[in-house]
């Protein structure tokens, strides 16, 4: 029977900069029941606070709801593991909410085959940013990535769309049914999950671009 091993806070994520959650990995338990507590203070403060919500984020997590989340202040946090034989602390972790945003997937993905008379046909893909992300404030720059593949293919073809919310693809296999998905990330944040797939049938007379 031993004191617990050192825990590690390894992940923090915010869906929209208004709330966030951090997760830790327990160290060894020393063969005894172990209690974990996360304490934090914000830059410029000395007063330590305990995690406001150990439930919402699941096991070994701390969730900071709206009233506990500030974009203006860096959070300094650590996890304490305690059993009957003693305690151990994680390293201190510094968190700036700006840099942990992982948005929801983009919305309203629309895919259409366009066949203009005077130009080569193309696949036109359009989407909207996730609702929880406020792009009007200006500090949020969302970047987008599209992936598509014929229904029975194993490999995805990936296209980086930058900040655009629409994209054209010229090279497609005629007569195939394609799956199309899109995801987004803030410049210094994390990729969202892929949006639900949209299916599109490419007409047999679709001319491949050379």
């Amino acid at each position: 029977q031993l004191p617990p091993g050192k825990p590690e806070i390894f992940k923090c994520r915010s869906p929209n900069k208004e709330t966030f959650t951090c997760w830790w990995r327990p160290g060894t338990d020393g063969g005894l029941p172990t209690n974990y507590s996360l304490t934090y203070h914000r830059e410029g403060e000395t007063l330590m606070h305990e995690c406001p919500d150990y439930i919402t984020g699941g096991p070994n997590s701390c969730h900071f709801g709206k009233q506990y989340t500030s974009m203006w202040r860096t959070y300094i946090m650590m996890v304490n593991a305690t059993n009957q034989m003693g305690s151990s602390f994680s390293d201190e972790l510094y968190v700036d909410v700006t840099y942990i945003v992982q948005p929801d997937p983009p919305l309203e993905l629309a895919v259409e085959v366009k066949q203009p008379e005077d130009r080569k046909p193309y696949l036109w893909i359009k989407w909207s940013p996730p609702t929880l992300i406020d792009l009007k404030t200006g500090w949020f720059t969302l970047l987008y990535e599209i992936r598509l593949k014929p229904e029975k293919a194993a490999e995805w073809e990936i296209h980086f769309a930058g900040q655009q919310t629409e994209f054209k693809i010229l090279s497609l296999h005629p007569g195939q049914k394609y799956l199309v998905q899109v995801r987004c990330k803030p410049d210094h944040g994390y990729w969202s999950a892929w949006s639900p797939a949209t299916f599109i049938q490419i007409p047999s007379d679709f001319t491949m671009n050379d």
């Epitope: 590690e8 992940k11 830059e43 203006w72 990330k185």
Partner: antibody
Framework: EVQLVQSGAEVKKPGSSVKVSCKAS????????IHWVRQAPGQGLEWIGE????????NYNQKFKGRVTITVDKSTSTAYMELSSLRSEDTAVYYC???????????WGQGTLVTVSS | DIVMTQTPLSLSVTPGQPASISCRSS???????????LHWYLQKPGQSPQLLIY???NRFSGVPDRFSGSGSGTDFTLKISRVEAEDVGVYYC?????????FGGGTKVEIK
């Protein structure tokens, strides 16, 4: 204990490439961005670029774009910085550095001296 | 790119005396999220840089309270209230509000 251990000194010919490694330990490698910064002899610090090891997303200083490639090998918790078309002005100590969930550098490697000379 | 200008270039200080380093940026360092990402690093002789102050005025873990940072917008100052022998080295200000991140030219602090 967080450690960033870099590869040894290199001497290179003008026009060639160099690949410097930075092996991370003491934390979950994919959690935090790795940055590369260089320091020419007797000079100040210059930021080269950064990588998010979780998905290999990179941002580069435009000054080095096209000449620099930053990559990671998650299986060995190692970041790499490759600089091509070397010239004498690239002679410098190259540092890797790690952020937290922030954009400043909390931990630094010991540095790797790259000398470009004919 | 944002140009960071540090003054003075070098500073010779008697132990126990204060020291002050100025850093000026060519553009405001206020991020569109409201934060100011101006930091101070110290590079001791023969060592890698180490973080002293983050976001203008916050001491990093383990940094003695004789170090303090202040300023806003484009003008920033690092103060050492009582210089000690272990404080010798080159001090750099750095901004990470705008990409590419940039550093000042450095201020060398030595003991008289």
């Amino acid at each position: 204990e967080v450690q960033l251990v870099q590869s040894g000194a290199e001497v290179k010919k003008p026009g060639s490439s160099v690949k410097v490694s930075c092996k991370a330990s003491g934390y979950t490698f994919t959690s935090y961005w790795i940055h590369w910064v260089r320091q020419a002899p007797g000079q100040g610090l210059e930021w080269i670029g950064e990588i998010d090891p979780s998905d290999s997303y990179t941002n580069y200083n435009q000054k080095f774009k096209g000449r620099v490639t930053i990559t990671v090998d998650k299986s060995t918790s190692t970041a790499y910085m490759e600089l091509s078309s070397l010239r004498s002005e690239d002679t410098a100590v190259y540092y890797c550095a790690r952020s937290f969930f922030t954009n400043w550098f909390a931990y630094w490697g010991q540095g790797t001296l790259v000398t470009v000379s004919s | 790119d944002i140009v960071m200008t540090q003054t003075p270039l070098s500073l010779s200080v008697t132990p126990g005396q204060p020291a002050s380093i100025s850093c000026r940026s060519s553009q405001s360092l206020v991020h569109s999220n409201g934060n100011t990402y101006l930091h101070w690093y110290l590079q001791k002789p023969g060592q890698s840089p180490q973080l002293l102050i983050y976001k203008v005025s916050n001491r990093f873990s383990g940094v003695p309270d004789r170090f303090s940072g202040s300023g806003s917008g484009t003008d920033f100052t690092l103060k050492i209230s009582r210089v000690e022998a272990e404080d010798v080295g080159v001090y750099y200000c750095s901004q990470s509000t705008h990409v590419p991140f940039t550093f000042g030219g450095g201020t060398k602090v030595e003991i008289k």
